[in-house]
């Protein structure tokens, strides 16, 4: 069972696994949640009862029971890891720790006018994990405003000491806000021969290559398949460090598959949530129960539904044998990937889909998308809400993205003339407007913030948050888009649609269903020339056919861009403005979002 | 078990050349690949050169045009020859199977099927 609130006074009794150091005990909440194996922990706060060499120790524990003895300890705090609860879990940490020193390698020491310029230099440095600054009050005169980098094996200090006039910090790259480029591709035949940090065994580069992502040293990696000539080293996942950042060293291999870490994309595309299924593959590993199961599905669920259980291997019936129904291996290992992967044996394996919930919920695939054809089907663009004004009477109004369980993403324009967002309504998993009735559950909007810098939408910042005054249950006809990744700018979006319920030419009415069109995004350069008496700016992406006749128009303002990349869709733009509609030569002119991921992580992360 | 013998380290005068040496035992070449890494003091472990199982070769920037890798498969045995040495390449050398770069910047811990020869010492006075 799920219990969040943390034991004070009280220390667990035995089933140590590790013991690190973190600056609260809510952060080694978060430690214990990541770790493989952690189940419970015990964190030991500042005590004059404790001796200051186990202050800020936070010991990450485990049980068969799921659970152990409790004992009264002053200053020690205890608690249960997130991995037993169904809510959305993340490691971003925004916490800036006051008198601490968080001990690591200092591998970096510059000047910093602020403890945030610190934090933000962390960010965009591929080897910083965490960081300590010197304020300008800090008694030694040359220590004064040195911003010091750090990094460690594990990605926590090695150590936590009081230290006057100092704070310290976390990285917040796993908060989506750091600069650093995104390089998804996959390098076939290649081996990166830099320094190896940690070796494990993965069914696929695709599953190395997230394992890399998670592991807080790594950087690239190298993946043997099991093609590999050596027998000794199929299915290998090399992780894998330099100074640079980089591979310095790349030497063409067959049956060998080279790739990077997604930390800085870790936000917009799976990397906890393994969802495959491998065939006539065996994961090895300590057994922890055997159980009777009709599918390999159904083995998943299982093994998903047991806290421990990290992944599986399920053995098919024979014929008329127990029912239909096979064996089920729940596995665990101290690493929570396989020690052995076997081919040729007939299991079919998998993972624990319990990590997802650390994914973003927005880089859940959805339904296949319908090819040709205009109108929508439910369930095609689960993030599309369609934002009605009541007043005078109610009407669609304009388009929205959902972003966030409490948070739509549209454009500041459609609020020329709304004085108050009571008279406002979200309504979510729309297809038809018609749908809308007197009783149709909506979501009230508790705040509208628009962008302070928005005068009109043809000269930007036509951007909009709606926080909504309850929070949306994902399902598959209301789930968020994700937002692009500030390390993807560079990424050419091939596959992208418009959506919404706008009129099909200028003059017309909103239609009743959901309508789609396929549009190429077009430079910025070639918009320019198309809207000589407009700045189109780096803030404003365009899209639309040179031939004109597909395009967003009145009333799908505020509505989502969505480009599909690497099988995730995300929300590039939000429809703004255009010169009429669908016309020759005048591409529609959308919002660009990627410039404000800072600006929405800022109003929607505010504490 | 599978051992990796270095031979043929030594002391040379810079501008000097020396042909390092390793032959395995319970193991066969032909189908690893092999490499020579070396480790000065105080410094990471660093790949100076590879030879694959089919035949691609690789040399570290420092050493290109002066270092050749080469092996003889019917003596189990890997050679590198290496001229007009200068002090930086003062190290101890060692011989690695299977092993795709170092762990923790250090030449002797592997992965599983990786394996590391003991090192010699190579010492180039200027």
């Known amino acids: 069972e799920c219990v969040t609130q943390l034991l004070k006074d009280t220390c667990f009794e035995g089933g140590d696994i590790t013991t690190v150091f973190t600056p609260s005990a809510k952060y080694c909440q978060v430690v214990c949640t990541y770790h493989p194996r952690c189940l419970l922990f015990t964190f030991t706060a500042e005590s004059p009862s404790e001796d200051p060499t186990r202050w800020f120790t936070c010991v990450l524990k485990d049980s068969v029971t799921e659970t152990l003895p409790r004992v009264n300890r002053t200053a020690a705090i205890s608690g249960y890891s997130f991995k037993q609860c169904s809510h959305q879990i993340s490691a971003c940490n925004k916490d800036i720790y006051v008198d601490l020193d968080m001990k690591g390698i200092n591998y970096n020491s510059s000047v910093a006018k602020s403890a945030q310029e610190c934090q933000e230099r962390c960010t965009d440095d591929v080897h910083c994990h965490f960081f300590t600054y010197a304020t300008r009050q800090f008694p030694s005169l040359e220590h004064r405003n040195i911003c010091l980098l750090k990094h460690t094996q594990t990605g926590t200090p090695t150590r936590i000491t009081k230290l006057d006039k100092v704070v310290s910090g976390f990285s917040l790259k796993s908060c989506a806000l750091s600069n650093l480029a995104c390089i998804r591709d996959i390098f076939p035949n290649t081996v990166f021969a830099d320094s190896n940090i940690d070796s494990v065994m993965a069914p696929d580069a695709f599953v190395c290559g997230r394992i890399c992502t998670h592991h807080p040293g790594c950087l690239f990696f190298t993946f043997f398949s099991q093609e590999w000539p050596k027998e000794s080293q199929r299915n290998l996942c090399l992780l894998k460090t330099s100074e640079s950042g980089l591979p310095s060293t790349r030497i063409k291999k067959s049956k060998a598959l080279s790739g990077f870490s997604l930390q800085s994309c870790r936000h917009s595309i799976p990397v906890f949530c393994h969802s495959s299924f491998y065939h006539d593959t065996d994961f090895l590993g300590e057994e922890l129960d055997i159980v009777a199961a009709k599918s390999h599905e159904a083995c998943q669920k299982l093994c998903t539904n047991a806290v421990r259980c990290q992944f599986f291997t399920y053995t098919p019936a024979q014929a008329s044998c127990n029912e239909g129904k096979g064996k089920c291996y729940l596995k665990l290992s101290s690493n929570g990937s396989p020690t052995k992967i076997l081919h040729g044996r007939g299991g079919i394996s998998g993972y624990t889909l319990r990590l997802c919930k650390m994914d973003n919920e927005c880089t859940t695939k959805i339904k296949p998308r319908i090819v040709g054809g205009t109108a929508s089907v439910r369930g095609e663009w689960p993030w599309q809400v369609t934002l009605h004004t009541t007043s005078p009477t109610q009407r669609h109004l304009c388009g929205g993205s959902i972003i966030g369980n409490q948070w739509i993403l549209t454009a500041a324009h459609c609020f020329y003339g709304v004085e108050s967002p009571k008279i406002l309504r979200v309504y979510s998993g729309i297809l038809n407007q018609s749908e809308i009735k007197e009783d149709t559950s909506f979501f009230g909007v508790q705040e509208i913030i628009i962008h302070d810098q928005y005068k009109m939408a043809e000269s930007g910042y036509d951007i909009a948050l709606l926080k909504l005054e309850t929070t949306v249950n994902y399902t598959d006809s209301q789930r968020p888009i994700c937002l692009p990744s500030k390390g993807d700018r560079n990424v050419i979006y091939t596959d992208c649609w418009v959506t919404g319920w706008g009129y099909r030419k200028l003059r017309d009415k909103i239609q009743n269903t959901l309508q789609k069109a396929k549009i190429p995004l077009v430079t910025n350069e070639e918009c320019q020339k198309r809207y000589r008496g407009h700045k189109i700016t780096h803030k404003m992406i365009c899209a639309g056919y040179r031939e004109g006749g597909k395009d967003a128009c009145k009333g799908d303002s505020g509505g989502p861009l969505s480009c599909k990349h690497n099988e995730v869709w995300h929300l590039v733009g939000i429809t703004s403005w255009g010169e009429g509609c669908a016309q020759r030569e005048r591409p529609g002119v959308y919002t660009n979002v990627v410039e404000y991921v800072d600006w929405i992580l800022e109003k929607t992360q505010a504490v | 078990q599978v051992q990796l013998v270095e031979s043929g380290g030594g002391s040379v005068q810079a501008g000097g050349s020396l042909r390092l040496s390793c032959t395995a035992s319970?193991?066969?070449?032909?189908?690893?690949?092999m490499a020579w890494y070396r480790q000065a003091p105080g410094n990471e472990c660093e790949l100076v050169s590879t030879?694959?199982?089919?035949?691609?070769?690789y040399y570290a920037d420092s050493v290109k045009g002066r270092f050749t890798i080469s092996q003889d498969n019917s003596k189990n045995t890997m050679y590198l020859q290496m001229n007009s040495l200068r002090a930086e390449d003062t190290a101890v050398y060692y011989c690695?199977?299977?092993?795709?770069?170092?762990?923790?910047?250090?030449?002797?811990?592997?992965?599983?099927?990786?394996?590391w020869g003991q090192g010699t010492l190579v010492t180039v006075s200027s």
């Open positions: 690695a199977a299977d092993q795709w770069g170092s762990a923790e910047g250090d030449c002797t811990s592997s992965y599983p099927g990786g394996y």
């Open positions: 030879i694959t199982s089919d035949g691609g070769t």
């Open positions: 319970e193991f066969t070449f032909d189908d690893s690949d």
